[in-house]
């Protein structure tokens, strides 16, 4: 891998509706399941076609789900928070943490900020050197004058 | 992503026994939640087994209870189905299949709409 791989990390509340299959999606993690190394959080791993979370648009794969209707799911096993979403009602608040891959490396999923998948360098860099020639232009016809 | 391969299986006589595996290769297995399914010429692929994560749940259709065992070994990224017993009717291609984590939703193991990934299968014939 070339580089260094950073994240911008971005926290949503995101408010989903129970649907007749479920809120639509899969979970991993906890303290008996690290998927993450040294981080026992809880993941989503999988989003179904044409469920809650599907239809919302929101929730996306990688994103780590923080607390499921205010309830903290720090420290769970994972059955404990698969049973926590199952048990949390017809309306369900999800506190969730996207992240946003912003250097070179594997892609990362695409947040709402990134629909390109550009990492932001590349912008940066050619909007510097515009600016730059643009002030250099300025300079040598304010001399002229 | 996840390659799945089956092997073991073959030509044998009723009331004899085989035994199949299922190697992961791309990702380590031990998110994932894994099946086995069959599909008899003319018919539907139709749900054999499942084992949860951790190994310490199984499920399994009526047809195999008592004659087939699901079970897995996460260090060998690798998922067993031991068949007893065989049939005639246990005649098939069986495929092994995956999902990653586990579903916040009613747990529907023998739902092949579940899974993500499929092997590519391994005959089966009881004569």
């Known amino acids: 891998m070339n580089g260094r791989v950073d994240y911008l990390v971005t926290e949503e509340e995101i408010n989903l509706t129970r649907g007749p299959s479920g809120l639509g999606f899969n979970i991993v993690g906890g303290t008996d399941q690290q998927y993450v190394s040294n981080d026992s959080g809880i993941y989503v791993s999988r989003i179904k076609e044409n469920g809650a979370a599907a239809l919302d648009g929101r929730l996306q794969e990688g994103d780590k789900i923080l607390s499921v209707n205010g309830q903290d799911l720090k420290n769970l096993l994972h059955q404990d928070a698969v049973d926590l979403f199952r048990n949390a009602g017809y309306a369900v608040s999800l506190r969730v943490q996207h992240r946003l891959q912003v250097q070179n490396g594997p892609i990362g999923h695409r947040g709402e900020g990134d629909p390109s998948g550009i990492p932001i360098f590349m912008v940066l860099v050619p909007v510097f050197a515009l600016t730059m020639v643009a002030a250099w232009a300025f300079m040598r016809y304010r001399q002229q004058l | 992503h996840v390659q799945l391969v089956e092997s073991g299986g073959g030509l044998v006589k009723p009331g004899e026994s085989l035994k199949l595996s299922c190697v992961a290769s791309?990702?380590?297995?031990?998110?994932?939640?894994m099946g086995w399914f069959r599909q008899a010429p003319g018919k539907e692929r139709e749900f054999v087994a499942a084992?949860?994560?951790?190994?310490?749940?199984?499920d399994y259709a009526d047809s195999v209870k008592g004659r087939f065992t699901i079970s897995r070994d996460n260090a060998k990224n690798t998922v067993y189905l031991q068949m007893n017993s065989l049939k005639p009717e246990d005649t098939a291609v069986y495929y092994c299949?995956?999902?990653?984590?586990?579903?916040?939703?009613?747990?529907?193991?023998?739902?092949?709409?579940?899974?993500?990934?499929w092997g590519q299968g391994t005959q089966v014939t009881v004569s």
């Open positions: 299949a995956a999902v990653i984590g586990s579903t916040v939703d009613s747990y529907s193991p023998s739902d092949p709409l579940e899974y993500d990934y």
């Open positions: 791309g990702e380590t297995l031990s998110s994932y939640i």
């Open positions: 084992v949860s994560w951790s190994g310490n749940q199984q």
